[in-house]
C-alpha cells in the first residue's frame, strides 16, 4: 500500500504514554505477532505453494502451444505475471515474521513489494486484451479470420506489460527504507513526505485503472458476450456464465480490501486512529490480494473437471485441454466451449 507499511509488534507501554516499565530491560521486545499478521503469513504460505507450482505447470503447458494457439499466449502471460509475483513471497513472509523488519536493503524494498502491483496491472491489462479478443470473436468474426494471429497477440501482450510497468513506477519510485530509532527496526514502505496530493493521486489512479474501470468495462463486455451466446442458444452457456462470474468475482473480491484501505489511508492523517487501524490490517490486505496469484490454476482445474465430467486425465493434459484449445472463428451456434468457455476459465483473477 502507499502508506508506509510499518505495523509494529505490541509495544503497548510505548505506544500510549511512551513510558517504559522500569522493571524490564530498556530494549525489551515482543515476540507475539498480531492476528492479522498471522493470517497473512498463512495466506502467503498457501499462495506461494499453490501459486508457484500451479503457475509453473500452466507456463509449462502453454509454452509449447504458444506459437500456434492464441489462447495459450493469453494464459502463458497471465501465468508468468502470477508466477513472478509469487517469487517475492518468501521475502515478504520473512519480513512479517520479523515484525516487518526489512533487512534486505533498499533495492529489494523498491522491487519486491512492487511486484504485486505489477501483477495487478499486468493481469488487468491482459484480461482487458483477452476480453477484447473474446468480444471481437463474437461480434467481428470476419475481422478475426483475417487479422487475429499469434503475432498480434504477442504485440498486445507486450503493450500490456509495458503499460503495467509504467503504472507501477510511482510506487517503485516512492518506496524507501527507513530505520526507526526505537524499537530498533528497518522498515520498507512508501513515503510521499510533503506530497500528500501526489499520494492521493497515485491511490486514485490505482483504484480507477486497477479496479473501477476494469470492473465497468469487463462487466459490459461480458454482458454483451453472454447475451449474444445465449441468443444463439450456445451450448454450455450456464457453465460459461458460472465460470465467468467466478473468475471476474475473484479478481474484484480479492483486490477490494487492498483498494479500499489504500484509498482511505491516502486521505487520512498518519497519526489518526483509523489510519493506525488500517495500517495494522495492511499485510492482511496485501496477502488477500495475493490470492489472485494462485487462484488461476485452481479455476483452470475446476473448470477442466467440469468440462470432462470428472478428472479422468492427468493434470497437464487436463490443463492443456482447457488452456490451449483454439477458438473457432465462426458466428454460428458452434461458438461454444472453445470460444466462450476457454476464455472464461481465466478472465479476471489476478
Amino acid at each position: 500500500m502507499d502508506s508506509f507499511n510499518y505495523t509494529t509488534p505490541d509495544y503497548g507501554h510505548y505506544d500510549d504514554k511512551d513510558t517504559l516499565d522500569l522493571n524490564t530491560p530498556v530494549d525489551k521486545t515482543s515476540n507475539t505477532l498480531r492476528v492479522p499478521d498471522i493470517l497473512a503469513l498463512v495466506i502467503f504460505a498457501v499462495v506461494f505453494l499453490v501459486g508457484v507450482l500451479g503457475n509453473a505447470l500452466v507456463v509449462w503447458v502453454t509454452a509449447f502451444e504458444a506459437k500456434r494457439t492464441i489462447n495459450a499466449i493469453w494464459f502463458l502471460n497471465l501465468a508468468v505475471a502470477d508466477f513472478l509475483s509469487c517469487l517475492a513471497l518468501p521475502i515478504l513472509f520473512t519480513s512479517i515474521v520479523q515484525h516487518h523488519h526489512w533487512p534486505f536493503g533498499g533495492a529489494a524494498c523498491s522491487i519486491l513489494p512492487s511486484l504485486i502491483l505489477l501483477n495487478m496491472y499486468a493481469s488487468i491489462l491482459l484480461l482487458a486484451t483477452i476480453s477484447a479478443d473474446r468480444f471481437l470473436l463474437v461480434f467481428k468474426p470476419i475481422w478475426c479470420q483475417n487479422f487475429r494471429g499469434a503475432g498480434l497477440a504477442w504485440i498486445a501482450c507486450a503493450v500490456a506489460w509495458g503499460l503495467a510497468l509504467l503504472l507501477t513506477i510511482p510506487s517503485f519510485l516512492y518506496r524507501v527504507v527507513r530505520e526507526e530509532y526505537f524499537p530498533p527496526k528497518v522498515l520498507c514502505g512508501v513515503d510521499y513526505s510533503h506530497d500528500k496530493r501526489r499520494e492521493r493521486a497515485v491511490a486514485i489512479v490505482r483504484l480507477v485503472l486497477g479496479f473501477l474501470w476494469p470492473l465497468l468495462t469487463l462487466t459490459i463486455c461480458y454482458t454483451f458476450i453472454l447475451l449474444r451466446t445465449w441468443s444463439r442458444r450456445a451450448t454450455r452457456s450456464t457453465k460459461t456464465l458460472k465460470v465467468v462470474v467466478a473468475v471476474v468475482a475473484s479478481f474484484f473480491i480479492f483486490w477490494l480490501p487492498y483498494q479500499v484501505t489504500g484509498i482511505m489511508m491516502s486521505f487520512l492523517e498518519p497519526s489518526s486512529p483509523t489510519f493506525l487501524l488500517l495500517k495494522k490490517l495492511d499485510s492482511l490486505c496485501v496477502s488477500f490480494a495475493y490470492i489472485n496469484c494462485c487462484i488461476n490454476p485452481i479455476i483452470y482445474v475446476v473448470a477442466g473437471q467440469g468440462f470432462q465430467g470428472r478428472l479422468r486425465k492427468s493434470l497437464p493434459s487436463l490443463l492443456r485441454n482447457v488452456l490451449t484449445e483454439e477458438s473457432v472463428v465462426r458466428e454460428s451456434k458452434s461458438f461454444t466451449r472453445s470460444t466462450v468457455d476457454t476464455m472464461a476459465q481465466k478472465t479476471q483473477a489476478v
Epitope: 522500569l22 530498556v26 526505537f182 522498515l187 513515503d191 513526505s193 497519526s271
Partner: antibody
C-alpha cells in the same frame, strides 16, 4: 537529584584519540540510555549515538561509524565515549545526555544533559 | 538522513511579543506507533541544552505554559505567547523517530 558530570576539557593533535567520561548519579543508571551529542563552535547539535547501559548495546550514527566507541562501567555508573582519528572538524563541545522521562524511562527524548566537554583538535 | 530545517535562523523580538519558530522535516517523522517524535530544546550561550517540548506539543515538567508546540507530519511550530527576558536563547527542534536522530540548525532569539 539527577546529575551527569563530564570530564574536563581536552586538547588533542590530529590523528589522536580522545576519551570523554560521563558519570551519572541520582537515578538507576541501567534504566536509561546514554547518548552523545556534539556541538561545533557556532554550530548546531549533532547526534553521535547511544549506549544502553543495561545490555551494553550501542548504536552509532553512520557518520561516526568506525571512529567512535561507547562503553560503560556499571560499578561506577560511568559512560565513556572515545573518538579516534581526530581531525580539526572534530573540535566541539561534547555532551552526554540521558534519554528518559521525569519519573520513567523514555528513549525518545533527552531530559538531562551533562555540562559538556570541550575537545580541541589542533596541530 | 532526515534534514530538519528551521526558520528563521535568527529573530529579534521584544519582551511581551508573541514569537513563532517553524521547523520542517525532509520526510515524514510519524513513527509506526502513530506518534510523532518531534521535540524542542532551548540553549543559552555556554550552557547545555534544556528540554522544552516533547512529541510536538507536550510541555516537559517545569516548562512555563507560554511555550507551546504544534504541527503534524513534516511541519511543526514552537510558539512563545509572551516573551520573557529569560527566553532569549537559541531554540532547536529535533526528531527521534528515525536513525540518525537529527536536530535543526537552530533559531537564535535575540532582544530587539
Amino acid at each position: 537529584q539527577v546529575q551527569l558530570v563530564q570530564s574536563g576539557a581536552e586538547v588533542k593533535k590530529p590523528g589522536a584519540s580522545v576519551k570523554v567520561s560521563c558519570k551519572a548519579s541520582g537515578y538507576t543508571f541501567t534504566n536509561y540510555w546514554m547518548h552523545w551529542v556534539r556541538q561545533a563552535p557556532g554550530q548546531g547539535l549533532e547526534w553521535m549515538g547511544y549506549l544502553n547501559p543495561s545490555s551494553g548495546y550501542t548504536k552509532y550514527a553512520q557518520k561516526f561509524q568506525g571512529r567512535v566507541t561507547m562503553t560503560r562501567d556499571t560499578s561506577t555508573s560511568t559512560v565513556y565515549m572515545e573518538l579516534s582519528s581526530l581531525r580539526s572538524e572534530d573540535t566541539a563541545v561534547y555532551y552526554c545526555t540521558r534519554s528518559g522521562g521525569d519519573n520513567y524511562g523514555n528513549p525518545y527524548y533527552f531530559d538531562r544533559w551533562g555540562q559538556g566537554t570541550t575537545v580541541t583538535v589542533s596541530s | 538522513d532526515v534534514q530538519m530545517t528551521q526558520s528563521p535562523s535568527s529573530l529579534s523580538a521584544s519582551v511581551g511579543d508573541r514569537v513563532t519558530i517553524t521547523c520542517r522535516a525532509s520526510q515524514s517523522i510519524v513513527h509506526s506507533n502513530g506518534n510523532t517524535y518531534l521535540h524542542w530544546y532551548q540553549q543559552k550561550p555556554g550552557k547545555a541544552p534544556k528540554f522544552l517540548i516533547y512529541k510536538v506539543s507536550n510541555r516537559f515538567s517545569g516548562v512555563p505554559s507560554r511555550f507551546s508546540g504544534s504541527g503534524s507530519g513534516t511541519d511543526f511550530t514552537l510558539t512563545i505567547s509572551s516573551l520573557q527576558p529569560e527566553d532569549f536563547a537559541t531554540y532547536y527542534c529535533a526528531q527521534s523517530t528515525l536513525v540518525p536522530l537529527t536536530f535543526g540548525q537552530g533559531t537564535k532569539l535575540e532582544i530587539k
